[in-house]
């Protein structure tokens, strides 16, 4: 379970400046390598599963909570970053 | 399993209040907003608001803001919605809901009927 | 708020027929980022509560019979039921899931003859 670090912090923290997190490109999804040894590490639900969650926002998988968060564009709220905060 | 589980109907008088219930199970009660959805006997659907169930933070449908209240209990994985100054109407089936992976509301509760009525 | 507008109000058809339903709303569900429409349908049967059917516009939600169908884009959706059944008995609401407040159609009830 995550401490103080709440969905709503994490949103605040990480929301001041539009995000720019990197996704693959069609021709690398799929074809990505596994990272370390192994079993590797598992897929980023947020790329698959989660892909469209967020209107406004960029998705981060709270592994804690096994629930995605969004981590809304500045001035959006909500539990998929919905609401424009007036 | 995901599973909403929601209080009884009720009865009540014009001007009280009632606090309907909504728990949780099969998932992490705090991973997740909840959502409260009115259904009016004309079948017409409107969203009333969604609470944070880690935070308490809610945002309201600016419709309800005066009629809603929204709380939960994070120990019993329980969801409330208060509605005060009933009247006739407030009658209508109450759902809480959850999004699923695809975004829009995948998991609903059976629906709570509130008739209110002198 | 959006304003979703659905169209007919009701339909009664034959087991095995084709159906159409429109959904309109008042501002875009095209999310311009992304080029996603955020446009959901529900079938709700009596006295049961909404089961999500489409999302997206054009996704069905997993377990939905191949039969529904989501199209459309920007403010004009559709929903069709290629050969419709005797248990698609329901009212189907279209639903803007973009923004605050979440705003439901009024619902086109679908009756079988």
């Known amino acids: 379970d995550l401490q103080e670090a709440d969905l709503d912090l994490l949103r605040v923290t990480l929301s001041s400046k539009p995000q720019a997190l990197a996704t693959p490109n069609k021709e690398e999804h799929g074809k990505r390598k596994k990272k370390g040894k192994g079993l590797g590490k598992k897929r980023d639900p947020c790329l698959r599963k989660y892909k469209d969650f967020c209107i406004h926002g960029e998705c981060k998988y709270v592994k804690e909570l096994r629930a995605p968060s969004c981590i809304c564009h500045p001035g959006y709220h909500g539990e998929r970053c919905h609401g424009l905060s007036l | 399993e995901v599973q909403l589980q929601q209080s009884g109907p009720e009865l009540v008088k014009p001007g009280a209040s009632v606090k309907i219930s909504c728990k949780a199970s099969?998932?992490?009660?705090?991973?997740?907003?909840m959502h409260w959805v009115k259904q009016s006997p004309e079948k017409r659907l409107e969203w009333i608001g969604e609470i944070n169930p880690r935070t308490g933070i809610t945002t309201y449908n600016q419709k309800f803001k005066a009629k809603a209240t929204l709380t939960v209990d994070k120990s019993s994985s329980t969801a409330y919605m208060q509605l005060k100054s009933l009247t006739s109407e407030d009658s209508a089936v109450y759902y809480c809901?959850?999004?699923?992976?695809?975004?829009?509301?995948?998991?609903w509760g059976q629906g709570t009927l509130v008739t209110v009525s002198a | 708020d959006i304003v979703m507008t659905q169209s007919p109000s009701s339909l009664s058809v034959s087991a095995g027929d084709k159906v159409t339903m429109s959904c309109k709303s008042s501002q875009s569900l095209l999310n311009s980022r992304n080029q996603k429409n955020y446009l959901a349908w529900y079938q709700q049967k009596p006295w049961q509560p909404p089961k999500l059917l489409i999302y997206?516009?054009?996704t069905r939600e997993s377990g939905v019979p191949d039969r529904f169908t989501g199209s459309g884009s920007g403010t004009d959706f559709t929903l069709t039921i290629s050969s419709v059944q005797a248990e698609d008995l329901a009212v189907y609401y279209c639903q803007n899931d973009y923004s605050y407040p979440f705003t439901f159609g009024t619902g086109t009830k679908l009756e079988i003859k």
């Open positions: 099969g998932y992490s009660f705090t991973g997740y907003y």
């Open positions: 809901a959850r999004v699923g992976s695809s975004g829009p509301f995948t998991y």
């Open positions: 997206g516009a054009s």
